[in-house]
């Protein structure tokens, strides 16, 4: 069964800056990745970035840099400097559309007691939806 993992990390150098990393554990080819803030994409969250393998990357504030890390994982840096940055309990979700598996989504947030710059290794988050 495919899985999606989500890792949220606060940067040590910029305490209000977050890095979100997401990955897809499956054999299909990814056609689209959507990262959202506040809840699942299309069901409670607002879109931060949309990454398409061929059509490129779109991002919205407070996303600062979205990029592909591998063919099946992405990373997204949120702007910091105190300019309306998210709180530590903020929910971030990643939705992967792949063929032939369909859409798989998981959410994560910063561990409550995590030190800046430190985070647990990425683990599969609970899968919220499989369309």
């Amino acid at each position: 069964t495919p899985e999606v993992w989500v890792q949220v990390r606060m940067e040590a150098t910029e305490l209000s800056s977050f890095t979100i990393r997401c990955g897809f554990l499956g054999s299909g080819s990814i056609s689209l990745v959507t990262v959202s803030w506040g809840g699942p994409n299309g069901a409670g969250g607002t879109t931060l970035a949309v990454l398409h393998p061929e059509r490129g990357i779109r991002q919205w504030a407070p996303a600062r840099q979205a990029r592909w890390e591998t063919q099946s994982s992405i990373s997204l840096i949120l702007e910091g400097s105190g300019a309306s940055s998210p709180c530590a309990n903020t929910t971030f979700c990643c939705k992967f559309a792949s063929f032939p598996e369909g859409s798989w989504e998981a959410c994560g947030s910063l561990p409550p007691s995590s030190d800046p710059g430190l985070s647990a290794p990425p683990t599969p988050a609970p899968i919220l939806r499989a369309d």
Partner: antibody, heavy 118, light 106 residues
Framework: QVQLQQSGPELVRPGVSVKISCKVS????????MHWVKQSHAKSLEWIGI????????NYNQNFKGKATMTVDKSSSTAYMALARLTSEDSAIYYC???????????WGQGTLVTVSA | QIVLTQSPTIMSASPGEKVTMTCSAS?????IYWYQQNPGSSPRLLIY???ILASGVPFRFSGSGSGTSYSLTISRMEAEDAATYYC?????????FGSGTKLELK
């Protein structure tokens, strides 16, 4: 159809607080984030912040931290914004605005006029 | 924060006339959104992603631009277009709006 119904006008004394509401209908409240926007003669339109009714997560414009507090009540599909320690500079029309399927202010409430006067 | 400067502040046009207003950003933005506001009404989404018309918006409206320079054009002015127009960016928090261009009917 999507509707955002805001509470009526408020005439308040300086130093007090006020809480305005935005009751939604025509869609599932927790499916879309809500924004609040201030409109005054002095500064045109100013974004106050965003709240996710799904998670309760908020994000504020630094200029309104300590001034505005956004909350939601899922049971009544209503978003609220409280404004603290009002001064004449807070006199304005306040709008709630819902996003579309992508980030944009697709739907707006009719606005709530807040007048601060001694 | 990104400052959006709209010009002109006020302009007037006769019915059928072509109208162009601009929005200049203090630093590069990915897209611009345009809103129309009639007196006593709430703002209404007109154009998103710089050039895409929102639902129900007449085809006489168009948007263009990139980087720091954007514009809104009305190909043929109509009486109902008399309103104030605001540009807005979603590239960086805090989200910001321009100060508006008031379009009057001549």
């Amino acid at each position: 159809q999507v509707q955002l119904q805001q509470s009526g006008p408020e005439l308040v004394r300086p130093g007090v607080s006020v809480k305005i509401s935005c009751k939604v209908s025509g869609y599932t409240f927790t499916d879309y984030v809500m924004h609040w926007v201030k409109q005054s003669h002095a500064k045109s339109l100013e974004w106050i912040g965003i709240i996710s009714p799904y998670s309760g997560n908020t994000n504020y414009n630094q200029n309104f931290k300590g001034k505005a507090t956004m909350t939601v009540d899922k049971s009544s599909s209503t978003a609220y914004m409280a404004l603290a320690r009002l001064t004449s500079e807070d006199s304005a029309i306040y709008y709630c605005a819902r996003e579309g399927d992508l980030p944009m202010f697709a739907y707006w409430g009719q606005g709530t006029l807040v007048t601060v006067s001694a | 924060q990104i400052v959006l400067t709209q010009s002109p502040t006020i302009m007037s046009a006769s019915p059928g006339e072509k109208v162009t207003m601009t929005c200049s950003a203090s630093s590069s933005v990915s897209y611009i959104y345009w809103y129309q506001q009639n007196p006593g009404s709430s703002p209404r989404l007109l154009i998103y992603d710089t050039s895409i018309l929102a639902s129900g918006v007449p085809f006489r409206f168009s948007g263009s631009g990139s980087g720091t320079s954007y514009s809104l054009t009305i190909s043929r002015m109509e009486a109902e277009d008399a309103a104030t127009y605001y540009c807005q960016q979603w590239t960086s928090y805090p989200l910001t709006f321009g100060s508006g261009t008031k379009l009057e009917l001549k």
